[in-house]
C-alpha cells in the first residue's frame, strides 16, 4: 500500500521510542466504555502519530482514536471485552509499534467521591464513608478500596487501610487528639477485572476532638 510517510520520515520515526500505556474505563458514560492511551515519553513528537485498535470489537474490526492534546481516546459501546485487541501507533497508515492487550486487564475505576468522616462520641470512633459509581455498574462492580489518612503535619506518613466495603471505622485511640487529619480513598478492580488504581478522591479534612467533644460531623 502506498501513502506512507515520505523522505525518510519513517526511518527517523523508527529511531524514536514509541512505548505507550493504556487504561480502559467500563460503563464510564452510561453503556459507553472508554480507552485512553498515551506515550511513556512525554517528549515524543505526536504531530502525525495516530492510535488504532483492531480486534475484540463488536461490529467493526478496527477503530481509530481521537487525539486530545497528548492523549489518545476512544469512547464506544463496541468493546467485546473477550480476548485481546491489537493497539497500534501509526504514522501515515504504517504501524510503528503495537501491543496485544485484553481490555479487561487494564481497567482503571472511576475515583470514589462523597468522602466524609463523622465522629461518634459514645463509641469514641470515626465513621468514614464514601461512594463509588461502580455500585451501579454491570461489569466492574467488585473493587478493593485503599483509604489513606495522615496527620496534616506528617507530610509523608500515610496510613493505609484496604477494604471492600464503602464504610470504615477508625478508633479514636489510634489517632492523635486535637489534630487535623487528611483522608482520601482510591479503588482498584478486585474480581475478574484487573488493572490500575483509580485517581484519588478529593481529600477530606477533619479534626480530632479533645477527649470530651460533642458528637456530629467533623468540620471540613
Amino acid at each position: 500500500e502506498s501513502g506512507y510517510a515520505q523522505n525518510g520520515d519513517l526511518e527517523d520515526a523508527e529511531l524514536d521510542d514509541y512505548s505507550f500505556s493504556c487504561y480502559s474505563q467500563l460503563e464510564v458514560n452510561g453503556s459507553q466504555h472508554s480507552l485512553t492511551c498515551a506515550f511513556e515519553d512525554p517528549d515524543v513528537n505526536t504531530t502525525n502519530l495516530e492510535f488504532e485498535i483492531c480486534g475484540a470489537l463488536v461490529e467493526v474490526k478496527c477503530l481509530s482514536f481521537r487525539k486530545l492534546q497528548e492523549i489518545y481516546f476512544i469512547e464506544t459501546k463496541k468493546f467485546l471485552l473477550i480476548g485481546k485487541s491489537n493497539i497500534c501507533v501509526k504514522v501515515g497508515g504504517k504501524s510503528l509499534t503495537c501491543k496485544k492487550i485484553d481490555l479487561t486487564t487494564i481497567v482503571k475505576p472511576e475515583a470514589p467521591f462523597d468522602l466524609s468522616v463523622i465522629y461518634r462520641e459514645g463509641a469514641n470512633d470515626f465513621v468514614v464513608t464514601f461512594n463509588t459509581s461502580h455500585l451501579q455498574k454491570k461489569y466492574v462492580k467488585v473493587l478493593m478500596h485503599d483509604v489513606a489518612y495522615r496527620q496534616e503535619k506528617d507530610e509523608n506518613k500515610w496510613m493505609h487501610v484496604n477494604l471492600s466495603s464503602t464504610k470504615l471505622t477508625l478508633l479514636q485511640r489510634n489517632l492523635q487528639p486535637e489534630a487535623m487529619y487528611e483522608i482520601k480513598v482510591r479503588s482498584i478492580p478486585d474480581h475478574y477485572f484487573k488493572g490500575f488504581w483509580s485517581e484519588w478522591s478529593p481529600s477530606y479534612y477533619f479534626r480530632t476532638p479533645e477527649i470530651n467533644n460533642s458528637p456530629g460531623e467533623m468540620d471540613p
Epitope: 500500500e1 488504532e52 483492531c54 467493526v60 478496527c62 481509530s64 501509526k90 504501524s95
Partner: antibody, heavy 114, light 106 residues
C-alpha cells in the same frame, strides 16, 4: 466526503473498476465499505477495507471481488470480474464508522449490457 | 448469513399517526441500525446502535429492540417522513440489510 466514479456501462463477462475518493477524512484511519443497490436484490453489502488494510468480503461474491486502496491519493478501489446483467446496480462507498455506516457517497450507476 | 425481514413492505400513514416498522433477524444480533432513503438519494443513517438517533433526526423517531426483534417508531407521522426505511445488522458477515419498508403519506 465520499465520491464514487467509474464507467456507467460494462460489457457482460468484463471487469468492473470503481474508485471511491475520500475527502475530509484520513483514509488510513477509516474503514471503507462498498454497498450496491439493485431493484431485484435491494441493498447488498459487498465488502470492506479496514483501517489496518485487512479486507472482508461478502461470501456470495468473494471469488469475483477485490477491494484495495491508495492512501496517498485518498482512494479506495473496487474490482469485480465476470459481470453479468444481475450486477446492474447503483454502487455506493460508505464509511464503516464506530456506530454505523455513517457517511455515504452519492452512488454511481453501473449497467451491465452488450 | 443473517436474514433481516422487514414488515410491512409498504404502508401509508396520515399526518399525526403513530407508525411502527419492525425488523426480525434470523439470528440474534448485537445492534440494529436504520437508514432512511428518499428517491434519487443515498441512504442516510437514521438510528444507530438500536436506539440512538443520528444527528439531525427529529425526536419523534425512536428505535428499540434486542436479540432478533427490533423496531423503528414514529410517534406522529409528518409529510417529510415519507421515505423507504432499511434495517442493517453488522454483527456478522456478510452485513445484511432488510428488504425495506416504503412509508407513504396518506
Amino acid at each position: 466526503q465520499l465520491k464514487e466514479s467509474g464507467p456507467g456501462l460494462v460489457q457482460p463477462s468484463q471487469t468492473l473498476s470503481l474508485t471511491c475518493t475520500v475527502s475530509g477524512l484520513s483514509l488510513p484511519n477509516n474503514n471503507i465499505a462498498w454497498i450496491r443497490q439493485s431493484p431485484g436484490k435491494g441493498l447488498e453489502w459487498m465488502g470492506v477495507i479496514w483501517s489496518n488494510g485487512d479486507t472482508d468480503y461478502n461470501s456470495a461474491i468473494r471469488s469475483r471481488l477485490s477491494i484495495s486502496r491508495d492512501s496517498s491519493k485518498s482512494q479506495v478501489f473496487l474490482r469485480m470480474n465476470s459481470l453479468q446483467s444481475e450486477d446492474t446496480a447503483m454502487y455506493f462507498c460508505a464509511r464503516e464508522g464506530m456506530t454505523t455506516l455513517d457517511y455515504w457517497g452519492q452512488g454511481v450507476v453501473v449497467t451491465v449490457s452488450s | 448469513e443473517i436474514v433481516l425481514t422487514q414488515s410491512p413492505t409498504t404502508m401509508a400513514a396520515s399526518p399525526g399517526e403513530k407508525v411502527t416498522i419492525t425488523c426480525r433477524a434470523s439470528s440474534s444480533v448485537s445492534y440494529m441500525h436504520w437508514f432512511q432513503q428518499k428517491s434519487g438519494s443515498s441512504p442516510k443513517p437514521w438510528i444507530y446502535d438500536s436506539s440512538d438517533l443520528a444527528s439531525g433526526v427529529p425526536d419523534r423517531f425512536s428505535g428499540s429492540g434486542s436479540g432478533t426483534s427490533y423496531s423503528l417508531t414514529i410517534s406522529s407521522m409528518e409529510a417529510e417522513d415519507a421515505a423507504t426505511y432499511y434495517c442493517l445488522q453488522r454483527s456478522s458477515y456478510p452485513r445484511t440489510f432488510g428488504g425495506g419498508t416504503k412509508l407513504e403519506l396518506k
